[in-house]
Amino acid sequence: HTAAQDNCTCPTNKMTVCSPDGPGGRCQCRALGSGMAVDCSTLTSKCLLLKARMSAPKNARTLVRPSEHALVDNDGLYDPDCDPEGRFKARQCNQTSVCWCVNSVGVRRTDKGDLSLRCDELVRTHHILIDLRHRPTAGAFNHSDLDAELRRLFRERYRLHPKFVAAVHYEQPTIQIELRQNTSQKAAGDVDIGDAAYYFERDIKGESLFQGRGGLDLRVRGEPLQVERTLIYYLDEIPPKFSMKRLTGGGSGGGSHHHHHHHHHH
């Protein structure tokens, strides 16, 4: 696994322990919490990052209307079970034997049950809608400039192939970034949209996962973009399975500063 050879650190994941004990004395980095070896030339999977985090001390509408099946991460942080590749296991359980099924980004997609709950497969999240509201700025953002800058960010910072950034919508002050990646589209070595979205989410919160970098400075023709609130919607290849009681009881909570956790239903 590649890492900075001179000081043996992981540029793409600061939640690691690195030492020059790899083949030929090469720097090898392992994720905190799981101890799994990570590839420091690309993003670390969200599952391993969550595990590491838990182990650490503690009108004319151009905007997209999320579908009725869109999920928002309502449950917040938990200590996940990851498979040998670092992906989320389809079934997650807590210490009190409460279990639930998750999608490929680790968001619960069923009601909670007991140890008898079956999750036959890990359902892929193929469409992620990142909904941002930016702070008022002295200078207005041009849509095409904003589009180009966000695409550059996902390409350069998160190493996400440009074809997976489906669209950038802008209706001041709301910005929406659509990421799409079907199972058939994702080739070996491609960054997963779920991992890219998670790194972006942490950057937006001022909690960068990259080693030694300052906070994300995102500018559009020199004008800084500051984010006041973020909501992320996840759409799965197979719709989630929640009881009718859940679907009819409640609606959506409001989104204020950063990532509010709730399932979103219209």
């Epitope: 919160k205 400075d217 995102l218 800084p224 500051q226």
Partner: antibody
């Protein structure tokens, strides 16, 4: 540490131009904009504009448009502010100041250069 | 342009006293920035985004406010705090500063 060092004092005649430099060190030069602010004798602070070294974007105060030009030399981490058609009321101390920002915060103008006194006199 | 009016123009206080400086905007702004300037020196950032203390600034300085009314408070004046203080807005161009409040020794 982050530091901005400006060129020395200048004395100019009315109608002439002045070019003040501001050399940055201690940070990634292309990562933040450089603003120019002046203070006339006995007056308050007046913002003139900024330039963003990464792509050369700039924003000028309309009051100075047509008279002010900001340029950047990334090879020497230096920004220049040129003010033309000088008049006596342009006599002031001219400051450069960098503005760091992230998606979370705008960190204001910090630090500032030591200032360059420009005297316009016939 | 947004006009920032600072009051009072001069504040005469003794060391140890509390200083309250006001900045009023001609139209609503989201954030205010505060700077300190001493004779012969460049301005120094004190507060960013209305209430956040800049690096190396003592905790006796604090900022608050919203909309059109903002305040800089120095809880207990130290001898080195006697200076001119400016507020600044970044809400719309041109960026503007207040005319300053001079805090002088009584």
């Amino acid at each position: 540490q982050v530091q901005l060092v400006q060129s020395g004092a200048e004395v100019k005649k009315p109608g002439a131009s002045v070019k003040v430099s501001c050399k940055a060190s201690g940070y990634t030069f292309t990562s933040s904009d450089i603003n120019w602010v002046r203070q006339r004798p006995g007056q308050g602070l007046e913002w003139m504009g900024w330039i963003y070294p990464r792509d050369g974007s700039k924003k000028y105060n309309e009051k100075f448009k047509g008279r002010v030009t900001m340029t950047v030399d990334t090879s020497t981490s230096t920004v220049y502010m040129e003010l033309s058609s000088l008049r006596s009321e342009d006599t002031a101390v001219y400051y450069c100041a960098t503005r760091f920002a992230t998606v979370v915060s705008n960190y204001g103008l910090d630090p500032w250069g030591q200032g360059t006194l420009v005297t316009v006199s016939s | 342009e947004i006009v920032l009016t600072q009051s009072p123009a001069t504040l005469s206080l003794s060391p140890g006293e509390r200083a309250t400086l006001s900045c009023s905007a001609s139209s609503s702004v989201n954030y205010i920035y505060w700077y300190q300037r001493k004779p012969g020196q460049a301005p120094r950032l004190l507060i960013y985004d209305t209430s956040n203390l800049a690096s190396g600034i003592p905790a006796r300085f604090s900022g608050s406010g919203s909309g059109t009314d903002y305040t800089l408070t120095i809880s207990s004046l130290e001898p080195e705090d006697f200076a001119v203080y400016y507020c600044q807005q970044w809400n719309s161009y041109p960026l503007t500063f207040g005319q300053g409040t001079k805090v002088e020794i009584k």
